[in-house]
Interface confidence: medium
């Protein structure tokens, strides 16, 4: 069998809401994956499991089952959403995310995703890990690849 390639493309959108009383942030993060089937037969994408980490702590998990099948030498783009919760004990991110006078409130999240594919009864798992910028201060739609974290974080002056 030839390879099945999984490419994490990036964050597609992030929708934010707050609980003022609990000083908690809710971020619904939609991510995009490209899955390429390099085989001459169809494969099933059985499930996608994803989790999001902030400051080394898991803040959200998601699992999608029986997603799709990918034909021979074909590629499919799949979006999946991970609901995340940044609670008060997490370095009071609420205060940063609600600072009204700055335009962008970028935080760095680690996106982890595992894709399970099956063909002829055989199962294969492919995992990816990427650091991404997400704005926790407003609803944002990203150009694909725009949210990638390139290991440069300059504090605002």
């Amino acid at each position: 069998p030839r390879s099945i390639d999984v490419k994490y493309i990036g964050v597609k959108s992030a929708y934010v809401s707050y609980d003022v009383q609990k000083r908690t942030i809710y971020l619904n993060i939609t991510n995009t994956l490209n899955i390429t089937n390099n085989n001459y037969y169809s494969v099933e994408v059985e499930n996608i499991t994803a989790q999001v980490q902030f400051a080394k702590t898991v803040i959200g998990k998601a699992r999608l089952n029986n997603i799709t099948h990918i034909g021979p030498l074909d590629m499919k783009q799949i979006d999946y959403t991970v609901p995340t919760v940044i609670a008060e004990e997490m370095s009071y991110m609420y205060d940063f995310c609600t600072l009204i006078s700055i335009k962008v409130h970028n935080i760095v999240l680690m996106m982890q995703v595992t894709v399970t594919t099956t063909y002829f009864g055989h199962s294969e798992q492919i995992s990816q890990e990427r650091y991404q910028y997400v704005d926790c201060g407003r609803n944002t739609t990203y150009q694909l690849g725009q949210s990638e974290y390139l290991n440069v974080l300059q504090p605002q002056q």
Epitope: A55, K56, T57, E88, E89, M90, S91, Y92, Y94, D95, F96, T98, L99, I100, S101, I102, I107, V108, L153, Q154, P155, Q156, Q157
Partner: antibody, heavy 120, light 106 residues
Framework: QVQLQQSGAELVRPGTSVKVSCKAS????????IEWVKQRPGQGLEWIGV????????KYNEKFKGKATLTADKSSSTAYMQLSSLTSEDSAVYFC?????????????WGTGTTVTVSS | QIVLTQSPAIMSASPGEKVTISCSAS?????MYWYQQKPGSSPKPWIY???TLASGVPARFSGSGSGTSYSLTISSMEAEDAATYYC?????????FGGGTKLEIK
Amino acid sequence: QVQLQQSGAELVRPGTSVKVSCKASGYALTNYLIEWVKQRPGQGLEWIGVINPGSGSTKYNEKFKGKATLTADKSSSTAYMQLSSLTSEDSAVYFCARIIYDHDWYFDVWGTGTTVTVSS
Amino acid sequence: QIVLTQSPAIMSASPGEKVTISCSASSSISYMYWYQQKPGSSPKPWIYRTSTLASGVPARFSGSGSGTSYSLTISSMEAEDAATYYCQQYHSYPRTFGGGTKLEIK
């Protein structure tokens, strides 16, 4: 140049109140959170609380609830901490500090410190 | 609350000597922060995010650690390094500091 200039030393009577100021210059006060820290003579540092100067949102160390009140005046770019019902235990140097987020939070600029002495 | 325990509380080192100050957290944290304070002055940011030196801090300083165990190291002690060093965590409320390590020059 980013600076936090604090008000001068205070000598106050037990049971009274004092208001310490922290004036920001070289940056917009509302772009950062301001925290307050206590240091008793010859002792370590104690976190009092934090204020978001833009919204007025505050968070206190349980130990200082009812003792310290944090406020900010955007028009004068000044943060304030009022200490009430003062006792000798409140005699200390009080620092304000600007806190920034870069992967995680840290104090990048500290105020000059204000010495509060409670004595009859 | 997370308790940070620094050791030693007081130490002295000769010029050129290697110095290590430890900071132990009562529960696991993401990063450690270090401040230097000299008598009569405000604390200065010294090391942030465990191992990143603040602007102007000499390269002889380094920071390391993870989980509950962190340290600040001076590869070769100099007279100007004599000060009190504090560790601090931002992982959870309330922000807490270590008790401080007073470093003296022999």
